[in-house]
């Protein structure tokens, strides 16, 4: 046993660890060369090369010119060939290939579970206010709002079909007009793109296949964003999904028919069911105004019930809303009548694990939260790295060719309409638009599926999930039948509209191109990632909420100068590229601004800075307890990390690099943490970074 | 039991007020309305008003709206019922009776106070 | 305000006879209705309510019927004890109101 196992599988050559690697990795500085340590038992331990995929210098630095990181990378087989084998070789080469099938459908299976109990999450931490954004009557008249209430809505509670069905009661009872409800439909559908979003980070320890995920990931919400970009002002303009949709409904009589089938619901709701259960109806009454749902828990108590009809004398404010004269009297004072009454008689309680937990659903929730995310996190990394271990030689080939060639040359073009369909029909099946790209993630990260290749993918998703809500709403009862499917059908002609936009012209598939662009930011500074997420799909639909609280002068006042510096940027950056010559000089690149205003660079070392000391303080706590557990159980061979020293002997120590446990891609998930003193000074102060800027 | 004790008669000059008081007892104050019924010498019953103690809402008949005020004092389970601007015509019995819950029925009537108003 | 009449306004029976005392709403109560007897110098007594619901305590002998406008108050056996007035009343809406009464005497 090595007194650093980490150390143990050090790659002799490190340059096969990382793509584009051209030479050799920088020499350790020579005042370091002869330098050992020693470690706790007294004996030296030689200083061990960095590998590439550890070093902040590599991490940072951009790829080699004529290195395209979007390139496809090249699955190579290392394993031993078929024809080399011996038949017990072959026989185990089998089981193994078969283990490796079952286990990543047990992964695939944890993780399209995870998602369901996120969704859950998310709903008992959010719900509740999520029901009260649509409670808000007044507000949703105005365009602007009721979409990023949609988006609003749908990133608190995970799921779009949560806030469609909420939507569509309002408009069945007349809380909200059909006109009022399309931006809301149009943020639901940019809501329910972040969950592969948040899925995308969880491949942030490889920086290539985090560059390729994430972009894959956020191409969907560029679409949405975009389309909305562009539909929005048009229909507030000229109503045209509103008179489309009723055109078509008056053309066709819809007659009720059967809901979508729900195959994967059938696989996953056994499991899920046993972890919690919620009472959907709690929100969507929260939303319909109802103030007794306000104390109302999300969580599934019972789950058998009967109802029993019961005449009860109830009072009304006045004899007006008596069920007739007869059965209308007065106490003197209040005037009663008889009401049917439904009771609700519990018979069985529901089998999850917080049925019996007097928690509130915040507490849960964020209980769930956590564990989803943990499980969400480990099947992904899983599921890449089973995946990394099957795509390899020829299987990699075939899979990257079938879902990546196009067809021979004149119906090339048909190939992508193709991919929609896949992704429509895909998702038509798992009943989840979310589910459907949140898999495809992965594969985009280890380079399965290019980003162009995933763009009609996640279109067809869209359509998938739209073509549901359409036999959903087939299947709804009489009363809803015409507004859940007028809703539906808007829902549908705007990702058609969206994909008429930014799909059939290649030059207009101006979300690939924003994708990378953010996916290559991304990359260099992971934690713009997280930035991106939050503003986009949070701090900047509540500012706009807020705003729109205040009143229509308000947000115009605040927004329009907004509106109006970004289109001036965009002008400016449109200008630098293609024809600089007429703009003054000073104006031809963005150094007359402070470099805070058009680089991340200052924001990266300020986010490292913040994030070393974290650091420091998460490794102290570890070292602590990992030295009790050491002494409780008497084992010597165990280490505790070194993170946390002082800073006299931090300064005293030489700066030794280490290679992360091998068992993960991910820094963030090493055993051992890197002496931080020194080493956060110079990667701070490299010279081979080069500052990436924002415009 | 259920008890309803009213105030001892009282003798009024017209244009004068009334204060009528009646004491509960045997249930609880704050769940059942209580309403206050005349009877003038000779004639059938007129209804008054009534109040509901648990939060002193009150409905008045019409005929007495401006003239009557109705109280309810929950520390001393007492109601009171004031009338005012009295005229010789408003001579009568004056009876509290508790309501029934939920409905209009008076199931405990008080004993009755005579009320003469006379110059 | 919804008229409440008795009818007839005076009764004249002896002890042992089955006595029916009407009353005739001027609209639609429902079962709103309550009967009260009265004896002189006491106050009202509730015997029925909801038209046919007998109040607790009050003997079987007597008895409500009716619905809407027309409501009737049967005694079956008069005994001594119920000579007295009787009343009707409508708790359909605000105001209540009573009927005139209806004096039952002994023959």
């Known amino acids: 046993m090595a007194p650093w196992p980490e150390l143990e599988n050090a790659h002799p050559n490190p340059n096969k660890f990382i793509e584009g690697a051209s030479g050799p990795q920088s020499s350790i500085p020579d005042k370091d060369k002869g330098t050992s340590k020693t470690n706790d038992s007294g004996t030296p331990v030689a200083k061990i090369e960095l590998l590439p995929s550890y070093s902040a210098l590599v991490l940072i630095e951009e790829p080699p010119e004529g290195n395209d990181p979007w390139d496809l990378p090249e699955l190579q087989d290392n394993g031993i060939k078929w024809s080399e084998r011996d038949s017990k070789g072959k026989i185990l080469c089998i089981f193994q290939g078969i283990g490796k099938f079952i286990l990543l459908l047990g992964f695939l299976y944890l993780f399209v579970c995870s998602l369901d109990v996120l969704s859950s999450a998310f709903q008992l931490v959010g719900g509740k206010m999520a029901g009260q954004f649509f409670s808000n009557n007044s507000i949703m008249s105005n365009p602007v709002a009721g979409l990023v209430i949609g988006v609003l809505v749908t990133v608190m509670v995970q799921s779009s079909s949560t806030s469609s069905s909420i939507i569509v009661s309002m408009v069945a009872s007349s809380l909200l007009s059909v006109r009022a409800a399309i931006p809301i439909i149009m943020g639901a559908n940019i809501g329910t793109s972040i969950t592969n979003t948040i899925v995308a980070l969880m491949q942030a320890g490889d920086r290539n296949e985090f560059r390729r995920a994430f972009a894959g990931a956020t191409v969907h919400d560029f679409f949405n964003w975009l389309s909305v970009l562009v539909l929005l002002p048009l229909e507030a303009a000229t109503h045209y999904l509103e008179k489309l949709t009723n055109l078509v409904l008056e053309t066709f009589s819809f007659q009720n028919g059967e809901d979508a089938p729900d195959i994967l619901k059938v696989i996953t709701d056994p499991f899920t069911k046993l972890i919690i259960q919620l009472d959907k109806k709690v929100i969507q009454q929260i939303a319909m105004g109802d103030s007794e749902a306000q104390n109302k828990s999300l969580i599934k108590i019972w789950c058998k019930t009967i109802s029993n009809v019961i005449e009860e004398n109830v009072t009304v404010p006045s004899p007006d809303n008596c069920t007739s004269p007869s059965y209308c009297w007065t106490d003197g004072i209040q005037t009663w009548t008889i009401q049917n009454v439904t009771e609700k008689e519990n018979i069985a309680k529901c089998q999850h694990i917080f049925v019996n937990f007097s928690l509130p659903d915040l507490a849960v929730g964020i209980i769930l939260l956590t564990v989803s995310l943990l499980i969400l996190c480990g099947c992904l990394i899983m599921i890449v790295k089973l995946l990394g271990s099957v795509l390899r030689g020829q299987v990699a080939t075939v899979i990257k060719k079938t879902l990546n060639t196009d067809f021979p040359f004149p119906f090339a073009w048909l190939t992508g309409y193709l991919a929609i369909l896949v992704g429509a029909g895909m998702t038509f099946i798992v009943q989840s638009s979310s589910v459907f790209t949140s898999a495809m993630t992965p594969l985009i990260g280890i380079g399965v599926i290019s980003i162009e290749r995933a763009y009609p993918l996640t279109l067809g998703s869209n359509i998938g999930t739209t073509t549901t809500a359409i036999l959903a709403a087939l299947a709804s009862p009489g009363n809803t039948l015409r507004s859940s499917l007028q809703i539906a059908l808007c829902h549908f002609f705007f990702n058609i509209s969206g994909i008429l936009l930014w799909y059939p012209i290649p030059f207009t598939r101006l979300p690939i191109r924003l994708a990378k662009g953010l996916g290559n930011i991304s990359a260099k500074y992971r934690w713009f990632a997280v930035f991106y997420l939050i503003f986009f799909f949070l701090l900047t639909p509540l500012t706009v909420f807020g705003l729109s609280l205040a009143g229509w002068p308000v947000l115009v006042g605040v927004g329009v100068p907004i509106i109006l510096l970004i289109l001036l940027v965009l002008c400016l950056r449109m200008l630098q590229a293609r024809c600089p010559r007429i703009l003054p000089l000073k104006l031809r690149d963005w150094n007359f601004l402070p470099l805070w205003m058009h680089s991340l660079k200052p924001w990266d070392n300020i986010i490292s800075l913040a994030t070393s000391c974290f650091q420091r303080r998460c490794c102290c706590c570890c070292r602590v307890c990992c030295r009790v557990c050491c002494m409780v159980c008497g084992c010597k061979c165990c280490r505790c990390s070194k993170c946390c020293k002082n800073l006299e002997e931090e300064e005293k120590e030489q700066d030794v690099p280490v290679k992360a446990s091998g068992g993960f891609d991910n820094t963030a998930m090493s055993k051992e943490c890197q002496d931080e003193g020194k080493g956060q000074v110079e990667v701070l102060g490299m010279k081979a970074l080069s500052n990436t800027t924002v415009f | 039991q259920v008890q309803l004790v009213q105030s001892g008669a009282e003798v009024k000059k017209p244009g004068a007020s009334v204060k009528v008081s009646c004491k509960t007892s045997g249930y609880t104050f704050t769940t059942n309305n209580m309403h206050w019924v005349r009877q003038a010498p000779g004639q059938g019953l007129e209804w008054i008003g009534a109040i509901y103690p648990g939060s002193g809402a009150t409905a008045y008949n019409q005929k007495f709206k401006g003239r009557v005020t109705m109280t309810a004092d929950t520390s001393t389970s007492t109601v009171y019922m004031e009338l005012s601007s009295l005229r010789s015509e408003d001579t009568a019995v004056y009876y509290c009776a508790r309501g029934m819950y939920g409905h209009g029925a008076m199931d405990y009537w008080g004993q009755g106070t005579l009320v003469t108003v006379s110059s | 305000d919804i008229q409440l009449t008795q009818s007839p306004s005076f009764l004249s029976a002896s002890v042992g006879d089955r006595v029916t005392i009407t009353c005739k709403a001027s609209?639609?109560?429902?079962?709103?209705v309550a009967w009260y007897q009265q004896k002189p110098g006491k106050a009202p007594k509730l015997l029925i309510y909801?038209?046919?619901t007998r109040h607790s305590g009050v003997p079987s002998r007597f008895s409500g019927s009716g619905s809407g406008t027309e409501f009737t108050l049967t005694i079956s056996s008069l005994q001594p004890e119920d000579f007295a007035t009787y009343y009707c009343q409508q708790y359909s809406s605000n105001p209540l109101t009573f009927g005139q009464g209806t004096k039952l005497e002994i023959k």
């Open positions: 909801w038209a046919t």
């Open positions: 609209q639609d109560v429902g079962t709103a």
